[in-house]
Amino acid sequence: QPDAINAPVTCCYNFTNRKISVQRLASYRRITSSKCPKEAVIFKTIVAKEICADPKQKWVQDSMDHLDKQTQTPKT
């Protein structure tokens, strides 16, 4: 779970070691602050849980791609 040490900076100290079904994921944000020990992705699930994940892992990249495509507005 992400940890806000000194708001508004949120950091991840541990990553989930299991894949989360992409269908459970609602959105994500990248953590790139130099105040944090490591770069991370925080996924928010459809039931509003927040999960820290390793952006180097393929499933994390696939999930971000999937969410990006899902949020793209169709061309008119």
Partner: antibody, heavy 119, light 113 residues
Framework: QVQVVQSGAEVKNPGASVKVSCKVS????????MHWVRQAPGKGLEWMGG????????IYAQKFQGRVTMTEDTSTDTVYMELSSLRSEDTAVYYC????????????WGQGTLVTVSS | DIVMTQSPDSLAVSLGERATITCKSS????????????LVWYQQKSGQPPKLLIH???IRESGVPDRFSGSGSGTDFTLTISSLQAEDVAVYYC?????????FGQGTKVEIK
């Protein structure tokens, strides 16, 4: 294609414990989320618990809290469900079921393990 | 917990006739951002594990005959067998996978009249 194979039928005395196993092939446990569902004779399907990657832990249905333990051995891609303090009402077929990364629903099921509790 | 309620409990239909099963959830299982209903339908024949028929409330699994269809959204769902065949005799269950604990309807037994 994921395949799920369960251990064989068991007969137990009331008060005893039973441990049922479920082995996955065609994938690994780290790719899946394994759950247990039971069905008493002539009754419906009842979710007992399973690994919830959103919480990073195994979660249990309230009805079974304290009496059921679900564990996994990632080296053999096998999950276990142990139910203690057995009573006659626990006589049922126990299924393991799993979803993969792209689905989120139970798309693979084991063949079922009949557990009979009788003195 | 989300409670799933099916009706009827049992249903006898003539061969070739339509069978309709409804499933109601006590809370919505629709996630509005992706417009997906987190609901599946299973078919269970005697002595067998459940077989997934439909996911996302209306998407037929590969290999499932097109006489099976799912519809509905939010809290009200329907499974329809447009022309009942002898091999469709089974118990049918809905299940939500929106939020844990995952919950099933009580089942609907479909028989031949």
């Amino acid at each position: 294609q994921v395949q799920v194979v369960q251990s064989g039928a068991e007969v137990k005395n009331p008060g005893a414990s039973v441990k049922v196993s479920c082995k996955v092939s065609g994938s690994t446990l780290t790719e899946l989320s394994m759950h247990w569902v039971r069905q008493a004779p002539g009754k419906g399907l009842e979710w007992m618990g399973g690994f919830d990657p959103e919480d990073g832990e195994t979660i249990y249905a309230q009805k079974f809290q304290g009496r059921v333990t679900m564990t996994e051995d990632t080296s053999t891609d096998t999950v276990y469900m142990e139910l203690s303090s057995l009573r006659s009402e626990d006589t049922a077929v126990y299924y393991c079921a799993t979803n993969d990364f792209w689905s989120g629903y139970f798309d693979y099921w084991g063949q079922g393990t009949l557990v009979t509790v009788s003195s | 917990d989300i409670v799933m309620t099916q009706s009827p409990d049992s249903l006898a239909v003539s061969l070739g006739e339509r069978a309709t099963i409804t499933c109601k959830s006590s809370q919505t299982v629709l996630y509005s951002s992706n417009n997906k209903n987190y609901l599946v339908w299973y078919q269970q024949k005697s002595g067998q594990p459940p077989k997934l028929l439909i996911h996302w409330a209306s998407i037929r699994e590969s290999g499932v005959p097109d006489r099976f269809s799912g519809s509905g959204s939010g809290t009200d769902f329907t499974l329809t067998i447009s022309s009942l065949q002898a091999e469709d005799v089974a118990v049918y269950y809905c299940q939500q996978y929106y939020s844990s604990p995952w919950t099933f309807g009580q089942g609907t037994k479909v028989e031949i009249k």
